[in-house]
């Protein structure tokens, strides 16, 4: 808190300008009128205030707007936004996409802070829905934001947004989310050639169906084990030993280390032991020679 002191003679601020950077904290408190500050917020960002000084300016706005700032002020907060707490932001009603963009710009290049997360939450709730323009904006600033959305919300993500996604941004996505994102990624990258396509699509393969994995196995992609282990179990099970060998290329040797983990474990149980032996990895647990395999799921579908 800044002590209440009278403004020294001749120092009363008539406008928000660069001369204020030389004011001490108590002088800013005493000499800057909160209403003047609110009407000239657009100037603050261009002035090299210290964060100590921004604290004082925030305090003045808090006194003027105890119920929360109006959007006309919020849009021009600039670096002052970094001084806001999630509690402050929960009092706001942000409806303009321009306001959202302006505040996200301040935090650009940095991790999503609690302030930003709260702002986004307030914005989406204020709009009532997560429309395409909002998603475009959010995924442009925070590609990792995708994994915080429900599958239903993800269904409205435009494929064009997928281009901004980095592999690490999908680390927290679960299979249900990848099921929605994979077809969008496939569409987004469809015009790329084989090797380039695989580099881009690799992070999304946790949502790929069997037929796409079979197609990839014909393209010498050399999928690494980390990617293979994230594939859907139901998509891996129908793959033959030959297809998995082609899919993994030189990485096929890594299957031995993962033979007790899904989806490798479940896949081994579905393969003929003879076929597994051709890999020369000592994988055990396949269907013994001479046993007949009945695909009951196919039988049920026919009846």
């Amino acid at each position: 808190e800044v002590e209440k002191t009278a403004c020294p003679s001749g120092k009363k601020a008539r406008e928000i300008d660069e001369s204020l950077i030389f004011y001490k904290k108590w002088e800013l408190e005493a000499c800057v009128d909160a209403a003047l500050l609110a009407t000239q917020m657009d100037r603050v960002n261009a002035i090299p205030f210290t964060y100590e000084q921004l604290d004082v300016l925030k305090h003045k706005l808090d006194e003027l707007y105890p119920q929360g700032y109006p959007e006309s002020v919020i849009q021009h907060l600039g670096y002052l936004f970094l001084k806001m707490s999630p509690e402050d932001i929960r009092k706001w009603n942000v409806t303009s996409l321009e306001t959202l963009k302006a505040l996200l710009e301040v935090n650009k290049g940095h991790e999503m802070s609690p302030q930003v997360a709260t702002l986004i939450d307030r914005f989406v709730k204020g709009r009532g829905q997560l429309d395409k323009d909002t998603l475009d904006t959010l995924t442009a600033f925070y590609p990792g934001y995708l994994c915080s959305l429900s599958p239903e919300e993800l269904s409205s993500v435009p494929p064009s947004s997928i281009w901004a996604v980095r592999p690490q941004d999908l680390d927290t996505c679960d299979p249900r989310q990848l099921d929605v994102l994979y077809p969008k990624a496939r569409l987004a990258f469809q015009n790329m050639n084989g090797s380039e396509y695989f580099v881009k699509i690799q992070s999304f393969l946790g949502g790929a169906p069997t037929e796409d994995l079979k197609a990839l196995s014909q393209q010498n992609v050399s999928m690494d084990l980390a990617t293979f282990m994230k594939l859907r179990t139901d998509a891996v099970l129908p793959l033959t030993v030959a297809e998995v060998q082609k899919l993994l290329g030189p990485h096929v040797e890594g299957l031995k280390a993962e033979e007790r983990h899904r989806p490798v474990r479940d896949w081994i149980l579905r393969q003929r032991q003879d076929d597994l032996d051709t890999l020369g990895l000592g994988l055990q647990g396949g269907i013994p020679n001479g046993y007949l395999v009945l695909d009951l799921s196919m039988q049920e579908a026919l009846s």
Epitope: P48, F49, T50, Y51, Y79
Partner: nanobody, 115 residues
Framework: EVQLVESGGGLIQPGGSLRLSCAAS????????MGWHRQAPGKERELVST???????YYANFVKGRFTISRDNSKNTLYLQMNSLRAEDTAVYYC?????????WGQGTLVTVSS
């Protein structure tokens, strides 16, 4: 985090010159602007000069025409050239970097102007 280390202070006669340096390290890409502040014995700390990332400079009235702030991006160093020094310039001079999302301060360097 940004680390700042000042140097160049010392005892100087009135009318003399000194050049202060401030070496910055750490996350310097997050710095928005830098400045020199000073604190004389028994007084509040006050801003002397500021320079922005685009090179715009600002000076307090009490040093205008005598002090010059500059920086060398290749060396990540901020400077304050102080000419025509007066007894009232005696203070501890602090380097400050305003970076995302806080102010970082050096430990200060003492400048004593005395005959």
């Amino acid at each position: 985090e940004v680390q700042l280390v000042e140097s160049g202070g010392g005892l100087i006669q009135p009318g003399g010159s000194l050049r202060l340096s401030c070496a910055a390290s750490g996350n310097i890409g997050s710095i928005r602007h830098m400045g020199w502040h000073r604190q004389a014995p028994g007084k509040e700390r006050e801003l002397v000069s500021t320079i922005t990332t685009v090179g715009t400079t600002y000076y307090a009235n009490f040093v205008k025409g005598r002090f010059t702030i500059s920086r060398d991006n290749s060396k990540n160093t901020l400077y304050l050239q102080m000419n025509s020094l007066r007894a009232e310039d005696t203070a501890v001079y602090y380097c400050r970097a305003t970076a995302h999302p806080t102010d970082y301060w050096g430990q200060g360097t003492l400048v004593t102007v005395s005959s």
